[in-house]
Amino acid sequence: SAHLHPRDSCPLGPGRCCHLETVQATLEDLGWSDWVLSPRQLQLSMCVGECPHLYRSANTHALIKARLHGLQPDRVPAPCCVPSSYTPVVLMHRTDSGVSLQTYDDLVAQGCHCA
Amino acid sequence: SAHLHPRDSCPLGPGRCCHLETVQATLEDLGWSDWVLSPRQLQLSMCVGECPHLYRSANTHALIKARLHGLQPDRVPAPCCVPSSYTPVVLMHRTDSGVSLQTYDDLVAQGCHCA
């Protein structure tokens, strides 16, 4: 892609580069305890870690961003680790008519890349 | 969206929060001077700036990421400023058979959000 090839091996050491990590959170943590009923505890996969040069680049823009960050670090930020895809979850809500199941398509990350 | 409402006014002051900024780069900067013929100078729109709580949240995931970053800053990173859309650009390439025009759909950012 654009004569720059993204790489998948982390040069910073294991677990340091952009990856998916599970964070446990309660509805209280999220401020949702008054309107989501269940489950009260969620396993939230999130994208964490650094984005060294060419690591898991999302696209051409990310590749040139990495390059320009090397040249102008004060002006151009390094790419950062964000979700590339999501996995849906279902939550039980209190509604006017009782309880309903609602799907969230963009709550839990499924994959990560550097953008 | 999920009872947390993203906001569009920057609490850090003008120009500090996630926004689109134009960066001028030469083909030499990008390492493309051997295979891209024209233009020699590119205006590259990139996403820069901070993502304070709820600012331009991309989706539900970004909203909860901001919330959890407030509770566990060492574990959960703050959302970061990345492209929400791109604008295509055309570059003139040197090819085996001469010169061709190639469109890049993901080279120049058109909008930014916090993800």
């Epitope: 269940s38 849906p88 039980m92 309903s100 199941l101 | -």
Partner: antibody
Framework: QVQLVQSGAEVKKPGASVKVSCKAS????????INWVRQAPGQGLEWMGW????????NYAQKLQGRVTMTTDTSTSTAYMELRSLRSDDTAVYYC????????????WGQGTMVTVSS | DIQMTQSPSSVSASVGDRVTITCRAS??????LAWYQQKPGKAPKLLIY???SLQSGVPSRFSGSGSGTDFTLTISSLQPEDFATYYC?????????FGGGTKVEIK
């Protein structure tokens, strides 16, 4: 490990009521809901309703509305299902089951309680 | 209410056979479908959730696929302990509903 343990078998007369208990262990009881599902002899599974252990909010199957009540006691991590005005076609094995979780999974089931309705 | 239609209602198969069971929802249920195995006198056991995710501890010969209205449970190589009744279940909306079941019998 996560477990749901139900009360023992019951024999009831038509018109009577039955109350089945389901004691949870191995997880935070208030983090999940409890479903009640029944299975008549030789038949398939029929969902009766759901209760959140946290707040007591319920959702009952329409055909049982008015005859069924589901409750929880958080101090003992126990869920209860009471069925009133019993009829012979209420004869079934009654199961409690934890869920749905965030992936709509009903993952842990009790061993079942046989309720026989006979005159 | 969402109706869940399972087919076939029974299947005769031999050890080592590949067995496929289908489940159709009367309306779209996204990927909110689960598969259960039940043996006589026992409670149902969760095999697959979210249409294709294998429950922890379940052998990898079980797999699920599909989304929307059409779903499949596949047992790649039937083992003696797999002879049982299988149910699909939707949890896209209340009331939660089950399919009628598929009995996998020894040929």
């Amino acid at each position: 490990q996560v477990q749901l343990v139900q009360s023992g078998a019951e024999v009831k007369k038509p018109g009577a009521s039955v109350k089945v208990s389901c004691k949870a262990s191995g997880y935070t009881f208030t983090s999940y809901g409890i479903n009640w599902v029944r299975q008549a002899p030789g038949q398939g599974l029929e969902w009766m309703g759901w209760i959140t252990a946290y707040s007591g909010d319920t959702n009952y199957a329409q055909k049982l509305q008015g005859r069924v009540t589901m409750t929880t006691d958080t101090s003992t991590s126990t869920a209860y299902m009471e069925l009133r005005s019993l009829r012979s076609d209420d004869t079934a094995v009654y199961y409690c089951a934890r869920g749905p979780g965030q992936y709509a999974d009903v993952d842990v089931w009790g061993q079942g309680t046989m309720v026989t309705v006979s005159s | 209410d969402i109706q869940m239609t399972q087919s076939p209602s029974s299947v005769s198969a031999s050890v080592g056979d590949r067995v496929t069971i289908t489940c159709r929802a009367s309306q779209g249920i996204s990927s909110w479908l689960a598969w259960y195995q039940q043996k006589p006198g026992k409670a149902p056991k969760l095999l697959i959730y979210a249409a294709s995710s294998l429950q922890s501890g379940v052998p990898s010969r079980f797999s699920g696929s599909g989304s929307g209205t059409d779903f499949t449970l596949t047992i790649s190589s039937l083992q003696p302990e797999d002879f049982a009744t299988y149910y699909c279940q939707q949890a896209n909306s209340f009331p939660i509903t089950f399919g009628g079941g598929t009995k996998v019998e020894i040929k």
